[in-house]
């Protein structure tokens, strides 16, 4: 009764999204294979007219108001492969008979998320689905899973149950799903996994529950295939016993209450030892496990946001394949990786926001480390070659510590300084907020940095030649908030420099860029500049894209170059409000409103 519907039709795909439809149109091409009716106001799904479209393979009924499915509504759709009923009102479908969706012989993916479904109703809704590979029941109101919940789904591989209120999973609830490989149980109310026994499972997401313990089955019938385990945002007190999971590649334990043990193990196996935490450390594999090296295949381990005070050497020993280790936001006071070959594959180590005072990295440890994040600690008086020993280090963040850089190789600095010269792999270095008083000459010699941030070191003195050696590599330089009155850096020599941040200093002059350079962004906010003469800025015109100048005592006259940029120049002068300038009379006006004749009054000549 809506004979003409404004659906879009391309080939055999019909999109009727968000058209205010109250029922399935009856006038679409009968050979339609893909039909999108999402975002309408359908309340019921009836066999007629849906059954007219017997060629349908994809049917999207998501985000409607469906609370009624006529028995057999999908029966004629014998080719249907993908069905979405997400975000409807199926929980109101009280009249459902058993197998309310009816048999779905060829459906491979079914989305029932966001329907407020509760456990008893779900069992009535799900019918026979022999080809189903993917089922989403996310964002519903399921409280428990029983042996009867998932029946007649022998091919199911992926099951999404996130954002329910599951508290109880009956033994054998997944037994009828022999091919299940991906299971998402995140954002539920689970408190304990006491007998994990899904040997065939490869991916398990248990994040955002209230899990206090995770324990695998004591006598598994076959080797566990689990490669991906997410337990973040739970209530784990100990590192779980994962010795039975030799294939783990990804493990996320962030945002728990984990503490690692500080004393020696009480039990040589280290699996069922007393409760100081060793019971939780994967120190050896259970007998009969072929690999014998738990966590030896782990690539990514996230332990951030826990309560770890110390990392025992024995813990790191087994992590021979680890590429990414996140220990940020813990309570570490020291970190040691001294042993030859310790963490040989580690590429990223995040130790940020701990309480680190000491860091001991062996001369040949961490041979693959590219990124080291140490911001927000209390590091000072480090061994001078702490970072020079890291042969592959590319990015180092030391923001918010108390690290003092040494000078060049021929200019040894005071005791406790750290060498940043001669680190040939290093590309990015942040020394923000380290209370650095003096940056000595040659501090970065033979370290071809592309990014250097020395901001928030108030009172910093930059010695002549302090940035020597960086002229051909440096692309980003930040010296914000250092109270600099003069800049002992010959900026025009930095031919690759693209972004320069000099904001929040007391600078009043810049060197003259007379030749074309690469600078694209120049931040001069909150300084003491009154003039930016064309003679100094001319060389920037070809490259500069953005110039930030707010908070400077700009002169209205003599700034012809700047006025020209405001009016028609290629440089985008950032002025969230108008740039204000002053005449000699201290009268303040918008620079864009100044006319040449304003500067000729009283003998004032525009010198540009």
């Amino acid at each position: 009764h809506q004979d003409k519907v404004p659906c879009k039709m391309v080939d055999k795909k019909v999109s009727c999204q968000v058209l205010g439809l109250l029922q399935v149109p009856s006038v679409l091409p009968p050979d339609t294979e893909t039909l999108d009716l999402s975002g309408n106001q359908l309340r019921s799904i009836l066999a007629s007219p849906l059954g007219f479209y017997t060629a349908l393979r994809h049917l999207d009924l998501s985000t409607n108001e469906i609370s009624f499915l006529q028995p057999g509504a999908f029966q004629a759709l014998t080719h249907l492969e993908h069905l979405s009923l997400a975000h409807n009102r199926l929980a109101m479908a009280t009249a459902l008979s058993a197998g309310g969706l009816g048999p779905l012989p060829r459906v491979t993916s079914l989305d029932l998320s966001g329907n407020s479904l509760y456990s008893g109703l779900l069992e009535r809704l799900l019918g026979e689905a022999p080809s189903l590979h993917t089922l989403s029941l996310a964002e519903n109101s399921l409280t428990r899973l029983t042996r009867h919940t998932f029946r007649d789904m022998p091919a199911l591989e992926q099951l999404d149950l996130h954002s329910n209120v599951l508290m109880d999973i009956e033994d054998g609830a997944f037994e009828g799903l022999p091919r299940l490989t991906h299971l998402n149980l995140s954002r539920n109310s689970l408190t304990c996994i006491s007998d994990f026994s899904l040997q065939q499972l490869r991916v398990l997401d248990l994040s955002c529950n209230s899990i206090e313990a995770f324990q695998t089955a004591s006598q598994p019938q076959a080797e566990f295939q689990l490669t991906w385990l997410d337990l973040r945002e739970n209530k784990l007190l100990h590192f779980p016993d994962l010795a039975a999971l030799p294939r783990l590649i990804y493990l996320n334990l962030s945002n728990n209450l984990i503490r690692l043990p500080t004393g020696p193990p009480q039990d040589s196996k280290g699996i069922h030892a007393p409760s100081e935490g060793w019971s939780a450390l994967p120190l050896s594999a259970p007998s009969g496990n072929a690999s014998g090296r738990p966590l030896s295949q782990l690539l990514n381990l996230d332990l951030s946001y826990n309560e770890i005070e110390l990392i025992p050497d024995s813990f790191l020993e087994h992590l021979t394949s680890l590429c990414f280790l996140n220990l940020s936001r813990n309570c570490l006071r020291t970190f040691e990786a001294r042993r030859l070959g310790s963490l040989p594959c580690l590429m990223l180590l995040d130790l940020s926001h701990n309480a680190l005072e000491t860091l001991e990295l062996g001369a040949r440890a961490l041979g693959s480390l590219r990124t080291l994040l140490l911001q927000g600690n209390a590091l000072r008086d480090l061994p001078p070659y702490t970072f020079a020993n890291l042969a592959s280090l590319q990015r180092l963040n030391l923001q918010g510590n108390r690290v003092s850089p040494c000078g060049g190789p021929d200019e040894p600095g005071p005791s406790g300084c750290v060498a940043f010269s001669g680190i040939t792999s290093l590309r990015s270095l942040s020394l923000v907020d380290n209370e650095i008083e003096l940056l000595r000459a040659g501090a970065f010699l033979h370290t071809p940095l592309t990014e250097l941030d020395l901001s928030s070191n108030p009172g910093l003195e930059v010695a002549t030649g302090a940035l020597g050696g960086l002229e051909a590599s440096l692309e980003v330089l930040a010296l914000q908030g250092n109270g600099l009155m003069v800049l002992q850096v010959d900026l025009p020599c930095f031919i690759c420099l693209k972004r320069l941040n000099l904001a929040e200093n007391r600078l009043s002059h810049l060197p003259a860029w007379t030749q074309a350079v690469s600078l694209e962004v120049l931040d001069l906010r909150n300084n003491s500049f009154s003039l930016l003469p064309g003679s100094a800025m001319g060389g920037l015109e070809t490259s500069l894209r953005r110039l930030y100048l707010q908070g400077n005592p700009l002169s209205c006259c003599g700034n012809g170059w700047l006025a020209a940029q405001l009016h028609q120049g290629r440089v985008d002068v950032d002025a969230t409000q108008d740039l204000i300038c002053r005449f000699s009379s201290q009268e303040e006006v918008s620079l864009s409103h100044v006319r040449p004749e304003d500067c000729e009054k009283g003998g004032l000549k525009n010198i540009n």
Partner: antibody
Framework: VQLVESGGGLVKPSQTLSLTCTVS????????VSWVRQPPGKGLEWIAT???????YYNPSLKSRVTISRDTSKNQVSLKLSSVTAADTAVYYC??????????????WGQGTLVTVSS | DIQMTQSPSSLSASVGDRVTITCQAS??????LAWYQQKPGKSPKLLIY???SLQDGVPSRFSGSGSGTHYTLTISSLQPEDFATYFC?????????FGQGTKVEIK
């Protein structure tokens, strides 16, 4: 919640009848609105519905002559019926469709406006 | 289209009587049925929706029942203000259709 019909009165045969329903107490983007008519001494006949998303539905027997539309900024739903004859003489009601259930029933009705088709 | 057949077309009853009106659909409407009351010169008023759910403010002497194609409106004890015409309506799908009405008169 209120619906008020206007525009009734005498209409000449073959002309177009235009009615307006002004609603208050609810939003036209949250509820569907229907027009229903009742010839003197007879039963109710559904004419058309406009959904909260703007979809339009018509009685097949009237479809070629009817247009339903709305102006959400004015909270108004309009009905146009062209080529009228004496058989279109009736009281015309606008009614809101209730927001729940899998069915479409009318939970609030206007007071009705009488349209007489006569030369 | 779904046809709705209402019976009887009229009936006479006394105050206190139990009155039953039936409505038959030409196909299964899965409880998508409403009952309305209309008094002379007034607009219809919703009594029952979803075959058996009482609309807010409607006296409990009114009740609805039925499923499939057969539905019933019952007034358990007729009151003077109940003398009116009653219509059923299927709301399962468009076009929406009404029964022809049942007039309840004073005996």
């Amino acid at each position: 919640v209120q619906l008020v019909e206007s525009g009734g009165g005498l209409v000449k045969p073959s002309q177009t009848l235009s009615l307006t329903c002004t609603v208050s107490g609810f939003s036209l983007t949250s509820f569907h609105v229907s027009w229903v008519r009742q010839p003197p001494g007879k039963g109710l006949e559904w004419i058309a519905t406009i959904s909260s998303g703007g979809g339009t539905y018509y009685n097949p027997s009237l479809k070629s002559r009817v247009t339903i539309s709305r102006d959400t900024s004015k909270n108004q739903v309009s009905l146009k019926l062209s080529s009228v004859t004496a058989a279109d003489t009736a009281v015309y009601y606008c009614a809101r469709i209730s927001g729940w259930g899998h069915y479409y029933v009318m939970d609030v009705w206007g007071q009705g406006t009488l349209v007489t088709v006569s030369s | 289209d779904i046809q709705m057949t209402q019976s009887p077309s009229s009936l006479s009853a006394s105050v206190g009587d139990r009155v039953t009106i039936t409505c038959q659909a030409s196909e299964d409407i899965y409880s998508g049925l409403a009952w309305y009351q209309q008094k002379p010169g007034k607009s219809p008023k919703l009594l029952i929706y979803g075959a058996g759910s009482l609309q807010d403010g409607v006296p409990s002497r009114f009740s609805g029942s039925g499923s499939g194609t057969h539905y019933t409106l019952t007034i358990s004890s007729l009151q003077p203000e109940d003398f009116a015409t009653y219509f059923c309506q299927q709301g399962l799908k468009f076009p929406l259709t009404f029964g022809q009405g049942t007039k309840v008169e004073i005996k």
